[in-house]
Interface confidence: low
């Protein structure tokens, strides 16, 4: 691949536990500033597959804050606004970075750690197994 | 709120840039090793709102890959396979954290980044507008 | 630092008002789309209500239309939500939220502030 030279001004890595542990820089950028401006907040209860929302909070990790989506039916919402069992609801789940404070309770020390979110459902067709 | 006494092994944080620089184990845990084994990775074309995944490569970045959601329709796979343009497939939306390398190819320093991807696709009723 | 601290929840009668408040602070309050959602006790997250950045448009789930105002005044960075009417199915811990509610990701929460309706 190609070798990317070095910034002559990159923090000093001599560090033993180098490359394992890096600086990092908390003041977020937040790179979403040009995001589309058609609201997506009430698709959770537009959606053939509505969920529910839970909040799971955890103070040892950054963000501490993370909403955990739950599809309300095991089956789809159909055309005249009733469960139908012969679809799907399923979570659409994403990995995501953290960071987790270790040791606990540091201010300026964590580890990186990926969780399994469900950001939301899709309505999907079963996986209909036959019985010869 | 509650006040968690401080681990007396923290790193000194003494650092003028604190608590806005911190120290990152790059080691990753991951907490995903009970996740339920069955594959969500064929949703994308099982789902009545189906999507393509697109790849999103940036050398700069921690993860340097990342899978983006594409709607497949505007609309809706409907029981007969045909889209249903009286419905309409949105994709769910979620912020991740990222490393962003700074300064640029620093390989150990870093600055939080906030990005804004598609994980997947629903299927919706749509807002219709009446006008009087 | 991005806060929103909520206040003016409490117990109140069936029928009975309250008037809750977001202050909000380390962001341009009038550049975002404001929202107030709540979470019954065991419930999911529910959106109540929004309203844009010029206080110009509102948006109300069909439950609280016509009982609840969301209301802002950039100038102090403030959000309100007057609840006028409460109902038992209003009890829930009621949040602000700045810009976007989906993603749910990010710490633009407060505390929040739990309004009990009952008698």
């Known amino acids: 691949g190609i070798t990317i030279p070095r910034n002559p001004g990159c923090p000093n890595s001599e560090d033993k536990n180098f490359p394992r542990t890096v600086m990092v820089n908390l003041n977020i950028h937040n790179r979403n500033t040009n995001t589309n401006p058609k609201r997506s907040s009430d698709y959770y209860n537009r959606s053939t597959s509505p969920w529910n929302l839970h909040r799971n909070e955890d103070p040892e990790r950054y963000p501490s804050v993370i909403w955990e989506a739950k599809c309300r039916h095991l089956g789809c919402i159909n055309a005249d606004g009733n469960v139908d069992y012969h679809m799907n609801s399923v979570p659409i789940q994403q990995e995501i970075l953290v960071l987790r404070r270790e040791p606990p309770h540091c201010p300026n020390s964590f580890r990186l750690e990926k969780i399994l979110v469900s950001v939301g459902c899709t309505c999907v067709t079963p996986i209909v197994h036959h019985v010869a | 709120g509650i006040t968690i006494p401080r681990n007396p092994g923290c790193p000194n944080s003494e650092d003028k840039n604190f608590p806005r620089t911190v120290m990152v184990n790059l080691n990753i845990h991951n907490r995903n090793t009970n996740t339920n084994p069955k594959r969500s990775s064929d949703y994308y074309n099982r789902s009545t709102s189906p999507w393509n995944l697109h790849r999103n490569e940036d050398p700069e970045r921690y993860p340097s890959v990342i899978w983006e959601a594409k709607c497949r329709h505007l609309g809706c796979i409907n029981a007969d396979g045909n889209v249903d343009y009286h419905m309409n497939s949105v994709p769910i939306q979620q912020e991740i954290l990222v490393l962003r390398r700074e300064p640029p190819h620093c390989p150990n320093s870093f600055r939080l980044e906030k990005i804004l991807v598609s994980v997947g696709c629903t299927c919706v009723t749509p807002i219709v507008h009446h006008v009087a | 630092e991005v806060q929103l601290v909520e206040s003016g929840g409490g117990l109140v009668q069936p029928g009975g008002s309250l008037r809750l408040s977001c202050a909000a602070s380390g962001f341009t309050f009038s550049s975002y789309r404001m929202y107030w959602v709540r979470q019954a006790p065991g419930k999911g997250l529910e959106w109540v209500a929004s309203?844009?950045?010029?206080?110009?448009?509102?948006y109300y789930v069909d439950s609280v239309k016509g009982r609840f105002t969301i209301s802002r005044d950039n100038a102090k960075k403030s959000l309100f939500l007057q609840m006028n009417s409460l109902r038992a199915e209003d009890t829930a811990v009621y949040y602000c939220?700045?810009?976007?509610?989906?993603?749910?990701?990010?710490?633009?929460w407060g505390q929040g502030t739990l309004v009990t309706v009952s008698s």
């Open positions: 939220a700045k810009g976007e509610i989906l993603p749910l990701y990010f710490d633009y």
């Open positions: 309203i844009e950045q010029d206080g110009s448009e509102e």
